[in-house]
Interface confidence: low
């Protein structure tokens, strides 16, 4: 008799793929545009990325550092009208893209939560949650919560409002903290909160260090659902050299939890390469004309247009990983086991019941390494075969689909491999 299938866990929409942050509408659209109507025209692009949610804004009225002139119920006219927003929501829904609204109050000011009048601000947020839930948004984001006094209790209250409206609504909190204890204390009192932080932001040094950060986090958070990003708002290029971007895309898409990206992460958008552009929100490079300030500063391979035509580009890798992440059970909700693979490497297996299994091997170092996959670290339910098929490599030149001997797995510098193998009873 065939073994009984394991019962599938309840899956919320944000469990099924990546979230895509557009914190600055104008930078995202460029060319002096930057409104909700224009964003509607970019939804097909988001669909092509197979992201499940768009984290938008803030787009509300906010006079810098002025509580009285901050209205979380009103859209800043520069971004459009409430009708434009409703239209965006409807279009996004048709494309199965959820919209999460950022309600960080004083986003134009010094302190995101204002220095005083915490209770006034908290009440404004509460009213805004109820208003925008009625308007049809799928969730909310609040950032810089380290600046919010009694953040845990406010978050618990806002979570109750959000979940009270529907279990299908999401609350995301963002913090600049990279301290695990601070992160855990925020999570403790908020069961379903999705938290973005700077926890992984200094992970780029070695495979061992990254492995240790990831496993510590997962062990500490237990079986709660988590999110993976390098910060609450910034681009991957703020933290990583170009040669590690592919590796991190592979890792973020295959760890257990929701990967969260900022616009431009999919093409390796780098403010440092665009003189005069703000680090936190450089202009999105749709094509070579997106940054006319310095002629010739932008080459085709830096743009969405150029990378869309190149199957070996970062954008193409992003799309493939996003697609795999959204359809494979082992990546959607599978168990995770990290294990030793040798110095400089981070490797782990994702598996769910009798579904196809995935092996990820990441070489963070700048030398080629041979992986010695140490099966002793794995439970019997997650044992490794002698060979696994190469689904993709972050580096060009490998023959995809070919079986690789796991005992002889050699990785190029900064190479990541995604391998697949069948369940064996």
């Amino acid at each position: 008799r065939a073994p009984r299938c394991r019962e599938l866990p309840a899956q919320k929409w944000w469990h099924t793929g990546a979230l895509y942050r557009i914190g600055d509408l104008q930078a995202f659209q460029g060319h002096g545009a930057g409104n909700l109507a224009g964003l509607k025209g970019r939804l097909d692009y988001l669909s092509s990325l197979k992201v499940k949610g768009l984290v938008l804004g803030p787009i509300h009225k906010n006079q810098k550092d002025d509580v009285a002139q901050t209205d979380l119920l009103q859209i800043d006219p520069n971004f459009g009208s409430k009708e434009d927003f409703d239209s965006l929501l409807q279009s996004a829904k048709k494309k199965s893209i959820r919209v999460i609204l950022d309600l960080t109050p004083n986003y134009r000011g010094e302190n995101s939560w204002f220095s005083t009048q915490v209770d006034t601000v908290a009440t404004k947020v509460k009213d805004a949650l109820e208003f925008w839930l009625q308007a049809g948004v799928d969730g909310f984001q609040v950032r810089d919560i380290e600046n919010l006094k009694d953040a845990s209790s406010f978050l618990a209250e806002w979570q109750n409002i959000t979940k009270g409206f529907s279990e299908d609504r999401l609350l995301i909190a963002g913090t600049n903290s990279s301290d695990l204890q601070q992160i855990l204390s925020l999570l403790e009192s908020n069961k379903d909160l999705l938290l973005t932080s700077s926890y992984l932001s200094d992970s780029g040094s070695t495979g061992e260090h990254t492995k240790s950060l990831v496993t510590q986090y997962l062990n500490a958070t237990g079986n709660r659902w988590c999110s993976w990003s390098l910060s609450q708002a910034r681009l991957l290029t703020s933290f990583l050299p170009a040669q590690l971007l592919r590796l991190y895309q592979l890792m973020l898409f295959t760890l257990p939890g929701t990967p969260v990206f900022s616009y431009g992460d999919e093409i390796g958008l780098d403010a440092a390469a665009l003189p005069g552009q703000p680090m936190e929100a450089p202009v999105m490079l749709w094509d070579e004309s997106s940054f006319p300030d310095i002629p010739g500063a932008v080459s085709a391979n830096m743009t969405v247009k150029g990378q869309s035509e190149d199957p070996g580009s970062l954008l193409s890798l992003f799309r493939r990983l996003s697609d795999q992440r959204s359809k494979e059970r082992s990546l959607l909700h599978g168990d995770f086991h990290a294990f030793s693979a040798g110095p400089g490497l981070f490797s782990y297996i994702r598996h769910w019941d009798q579904n196809e299994r995935f092996l990820v091997v990441l070489n963070f170092g700048d030398v080629g390494l041979s992986a010695g996959l140490q099966a002793s670290d794995l439970p019997a339910s997650a044992s490794l075969p002698a060979k696994a098929d190469l689904l993709l490599s972050t580096q060009p030149g490998r023959e995809e689909g070919s079986p690789l001997e796991l005992e002889r797995l050699k990785l190029e510098p900064h190479e990541g491999l995604l391998l697949r193998f069948p369940y064996a009873a």
Epitope: S370, G372, E407
Partner: antibody, heavy 118, light 112 residues
């Protein structure tokens, strides 16, 4: 200091048994595949056996298959070679060696001498 | 089993002169990912073998740059650009492509 130290060799009669040990220090044995290589007096090197990191996979040279058993106790940081039904041609200096991540032998012990004679 | 054949079996060399040892395998040692699974060892008198070259051409750490390995498939060569007195001993090639791993017979390098 990273090193391997073999022990357990000695004089044994044909048909007898011996158990060789290889103690690892300065590194964790559990993270390495390990091998035994032997060298008869005045002769060349001959590979004998290997074991993977968790002991779940082993390989042997045809000349020792069915008589020798390689094993490991990762908790004790020790590798073993159980030798049964010994023959005169098994007389050799037995080395244990560490296999570096699927590429090469990067660390050898000093060897322990096994003499099979009546 | 893969058979490894070394030549010459004895190699008298004058210090400062170059030396070359050949190693042939009965089947190709070139793995599909591009590496040749052929290593070179030196066993000095009364000592354990020490690694000189791995994967055909990669010098092991601490090995002087006068040692170099070359070749691919079935034909490999170990070269010493200028032999020194401390280089005496027996040189072995070894294939680690598949078990049973096999060594060459050894080449004894002596100083003239």
């Amino acid at each position: 200091e990273v090193q391997l130290v073999e022990s357990g060799g000695g004089l044994v009669q044909p048909g007898g048994s011996l158990r060789l040990s290889c103690a690892a220090s300065g590194f964790t044995l559990s993270s390495s595949w390990m091998h035994w290589v032997r060298q008869a007096p005045g002769k060349g090197l001959v590979w004998v056996s290997r074991i993977n990191s968790d002991g779940s996979s082993t390989s042997y040279a045809d000349s020792v298959k069915g008589r020798f058993t390689i094993s490991r106790d990762n908790a004790k940081n020790t590798l073993y070679l159980q030798m049964n039904s010994l023959r005169a041609e098994d007389t050799a200096l037995y080395y244990c060696a560490r296999w570096n991540w699927g590429w090469y032998f990067d660390l050898w012990g000093r060897g322990t001498l096994v003499t099979v004679s009546s | 089993d893969i058979v490894m054949t070394q030549s010459p079996l004895s190699l008298p060399v004058t210090p400062g002169e170059p030396a070359s040892i050949s190693c042939r395998s009965s089947q190709s040692l070139l793995h599909s990912h591009g590496d040749n699974y052929l290593d070179w060892f030196l066993q000095k008198p009364g000592q354990s073998p020490q690694l000189l070259i791995y994967l055909g051409s990669n010098r092991a750490s601490g090995v002087p740059d006068r040692f170099s390995g070359s070749g691919s498939g079935t034909d490999f060569t170990l070269k010493i650009s200028r032999v020194e007195a401390e280089d005496v001993g027996v040189y072995y090639c070894m294939q680690t492509l598949e078990t049973p791993y096999t060594f060459g017979q050894g080449t004894k390098l002596q100083i003239k």
